[in-house]
Interface confidence: medium
């Protein structure tokens, strides 16, 4: 057991250095906040991740840690830094008692506090029979790269690293952090403390049964026998990887993160940080049956979120429980029954489920990727991964109702050639969260900072909304949903693509008042119409209906109701062409679609008109879709006539495009 | 540095009561939580009662309520343990651990409690 005369000395000497004055405020009079996980028995009270404002250097981190120390000491409370982080995120880790946190809000630089909290492996070892030999052969599966030139860190449990699959694949690190083990009865047994790194290492990139054969791989260990670690801990293993980045700069990486805890804004923080940094890393969505965005780091957009399907494209049920789901999730990949390195013997394979297993297909996918394309960036990386996916495959009826549009249909695949995809013109759909259902409520889409906003929509199920409008939020383009009185609430949409030296810009036209509806169009030389939008502060827009079809010769325009603004984004980028095409229905119908053809890129959904009976728009993958309320409610008047109109894009030049700009 | 000494263990019969006693001396923060754990051969520590520092609330392991009482002794700086109704599966040497960084719940896992004293063993006759 350790000595700890030492904190009491360095405590003593604090209090005789710092000044009185010690509690002091915050700077600029901003009040620090303090977070914990929403899952109770996930709490781990008593140890508290201090975070510091953005541009806190070392010292001041340490400076900081001590002035709470010494305070701490004043009112007679012991406290015991932990780790001081530094090179992701400026902060501290501490012990201490929950009395002391109004104390340390107070103190200079802190941006927020938040409670450490548990994470756990996210697989289930659906059955136990070891399978020898395994269940595939070597020749059945021959990737055309196999991810040589990537590294891919597994946070995890500690694994068997003379397992015959991965043998000479993976470097365990000298990382290691974890909680003690419960419960009095628990024996540590190595092969059990092995069990899901290696089988999540022989996914990604096992000799017989990987994904990226070729691929090598680092573990940390962050997860302990029983699978489960803490936020902090997750934290330092981040941190260690970045600095590990730093010291010795190698080709791409990607992180696997395995695991899932309750959402918590500093887990979530720190994986921005690290994919701003230039790294990709892929999360399980959890195995709770839930809202991917609850839980850790699977809400965070800079992540790659996977979530389980199995061999029947359904989503994966694990015991009461299954797979997350929602807007959080970027895709599923298969999850059950997954046959990978067993941790029994060093030639034993086993069958596990989880979304752990689905994230590691997508990791081995991506080391593929990145290794045929170095270059890729995380937004084109992503776009890549959403674009090759099998689409519609995935029973719905699965998930909540109210969850299922919000839920990709997407199953994550090997692109057909791992090269040739650079003319492409790629967009993907970004849900915001729901607005809430106050009268002025709003809600924001964003997409990624290397990814262009061609376009904005919105959608409300109850139909009581008031549009949405594209805006500039911190230099960039954010697209903002408004909800309406006695609205349950609104979500915002945003269509995010990829388009290289694109120079785009909105235009608005006001309210018209006249009886011809309201337009706006392109005006400038060589930007062409990606995306209508339309806002309206009137409660309801009536039933007045403004010309469906466009005037010939016009297709840079945007028409909407008399009473709404109207608004256009038009870009101008290197050999991009776009159309519109509509698709009308003059009977009611609760949903309308209009798809692109083949070689275009849906980057604009909107609808005609824009009245009350309207729920909103929505693109999923390259079709635009419409919906109105059930028709039972809206009659077959001519007010239930809905036009779904697309804005469809293609670009030749983009391969020359991306290219110039290196 | 925080020294914790046990004492009041011995033979007992079934049925029968014994006080067990903790000492601490040396740097005691004035805000912690001292817990009673015991552990019988070839098994791991078993949390019993804790006692919070100040304020003396307690909290008892669900095998012991109704018959084990912690309590603070302010004259002697110490703790004790009051069991009563004992059993033959009490049997165990006893410890008393302090967790210097209370939390608002009390903690009943062992690595959560960073000093530790020697023991004192308890054995109950059938």
């Known amino acids: 057991q350790e000595d700890e005369d030492g904190d009491y000395e360095e405590l003593v000497l604090a209090l005789r250095s710092e000044e009185d004055g010690l509690a002091e405020a915050p700077e600029h009079g901003t009040t620090a906040t303090f977070h914990r996980c929403a899952k109770d028995p996930w709490r781990l009270p008593g140890t508290y991740v201090v975070v510091l404002k953005e541009e806190t250097h070392l010292s001041q981190s340490e400076r900081t840690a001590r002035r709470l120390q010494a305070q701490a000491a004043r009112r007679g409370y012991l406290t015991k830094i932990l780790h001081v982080f530094h090179g992701l995120l400026p902060g501290f880790l501490v012990k201490m008692s929950g009395d002391l946190l109004e104390l340390a809000l107070k103190l200079p630089h802190v941006d927020y506090i938040e409670e450490d909290s548990s994470v756990f492996a996210q697989s289930i070892p659906w059955n136990l029979e070891r399978i020898t030999p395994p269940r595939y052969r070597a020749d059945e599966y021959q990737p055309p790269d196999g991810g040589s030139l990537v590294e891919v860190y597994l946070l995890d449990t500690s694994i068997q690293s003379d397992h015959r699959e991965i043998e000479g694949r993976v470097m365990v690190t000298d990382f290691e952090n974890v909680p003690e083990e419960d419960g009095t009865r628990f024996h540590r047994q190595a092969s059990k403390c092995d069990s899901h790194g290696t089988h999540l290492a022989g996914v990604v990139s096992g000799r017989d049964a990987g994904v990226a054969k070729g691929a090598s791989m680092r573990s940390l260990r962050v997860l302990n026998c029983q699978g489960k670690g803490t936020v902090s801990g997750t934290l330092i293993g981040l941190e260690f990887i970045r600095k590990s980045q730093l010291v010795q700069p190698v080709g791409p990486l990607v992180v696997l993160l395995p695991l899932a805890g309750g959402y918590s804004r500093v887990l979530n923080a720190a994986c921005q940080r690290l994919a701003r940094a230039g790294v990709v890393l892929v999360t399980a969505a959890g195995n709770f049956r839930d809202d991917a965005c609850l839980y850790s780091p699977a809400s965070a957009p800079e992540v790659i979120t996977v979530g389980a399907t199995n061999a029947q494209d359904q989503p994966v049920t694990l015991g009461t429980l299954g797979t997350n789901f929602g807007r959080c999730v970027d895709l599923f990949a298969p999850g059950e029954d997954i046959i990978g390195a067993s941790s029994d013997c060093s030639t034993c394979f086993v069958s596990q489920s989880g979304t752990s297993q689905a994230a590691a297909h997508v990791a081995g996918i991506a080391a593929m990727m990145l290794s045929a394309e170095p270059e890729l960036t995380l937004a084109e990386l992503r776009q890549r991964l959403i674009h090759f996916s099998a689409k519609d495959v995935i029973n719905e009826a699965w998930f909540p109702e109210d969850q299922r549009v919000l839920t990709p249909n997407l199953v994550a695949a090997l692109p057909p050639s791992t090269h040739g995809a650079g003319w492409q013109l790629f967009c993907r759909t970004v849900w915001s969260a729901h607005s809430g259902p106050t009268r002025m409520a709003t809600a924001v889409a964003r997409c990624a900072p290397d990814e262009e906003l061609l376009s904005c929509s919105s959608f409300s199920r109850s139909g009581k909304r008031r549009g949405e409008r594209m805006e500039a939020q911190g230099g960039k383009l954010v697209c903002r949903a408004h909800n309406a009185f006695g609205g349950e609430g609104v979500y915002a949409i945003a269509r995010c693509c990829l388009l290289p030296q694109a120079n785009c810009s909105v235009h608005t036209a006001p309210p018209a008042e006249a009886s011809m509806g309201t337009r706006v169009h392109c005006h400038q030389q060589g930007h062409v119409l990606t995306g209508c939008s339309s806002h309206w502060e009137v409660e309801d827009l009536g039933t007045h209906k403004p010309p469906v079809l466009r005037p010939r010769g016009q297709p840079n325009q945007c028409v909407g109701h008399r009473e709404a603004s109207i608004h256009a984004s038009c870009c101008h980028a290197p050999g991009l062409e776009c159309k519109v095409k509509e698709h009308g229905i003059p009977a009611p119908q609760e949903q309308v679609t209009v798809a692109c053809e083949e070689g275009w890129t849906l980057t604009g959904c909107s609808a005609l008109p824009g009245t009350s009976h309207v729920l909103g728009a929505y693109a999923v993958d390259n079709t635009c879709v419409v919906r109105s309320r059930d028709v039972s409610t809206t009659g077959s008047t001519s007010e239930g006539a809905v036009t779904a109109v697309a804005i469809c894009c293609r670009s030749r030049h983009l391969a020359q495009a991306s290219q110039e700009l290196q | 540095q925080v020294k914790l000494e046990e004492s009041g263990g011995g033979l007992v019969q079934a049925g029968g009561s014994l006080r067990l006693s903790c000492a601490a001396s040396g740097r005691t923060p004035r805000h912690y939580i001292l817990g009673w754990f015991r552990q019988a051969p070839g098994k791991l520590p078993e949390f019993v009662a804790a006692?919070?520092?100040?304020?003396?609330?307690?909290y008892y392991a669900d095998s012991v309520k109704g018959r084990d009482t912690i309590s603070k002794d302010h004259t002697k700086n110490a703790v004790d343990l009051q069991m009563n109704s004992l059993k033959p599966e009490d049997s165990a040497t006893y410890y008393c651990?302090?967790?210097?960084?209370?939390?608002?719940?009390?903690?009943?896992?062992?690595?959560?409690?960073?000093?530790w004293g020697q023991g004192t063993q308890v054995t109950v006759s059938s």
């Open positions: 006692v919070r520092e100040p304020g003396s609330s307690t």
């Open positions: 651990a302090v967790d210097p960084y209370p939390t608002p719940e009390f903690t009943t896992h062992v690595g959560h409690y960073d000093y």
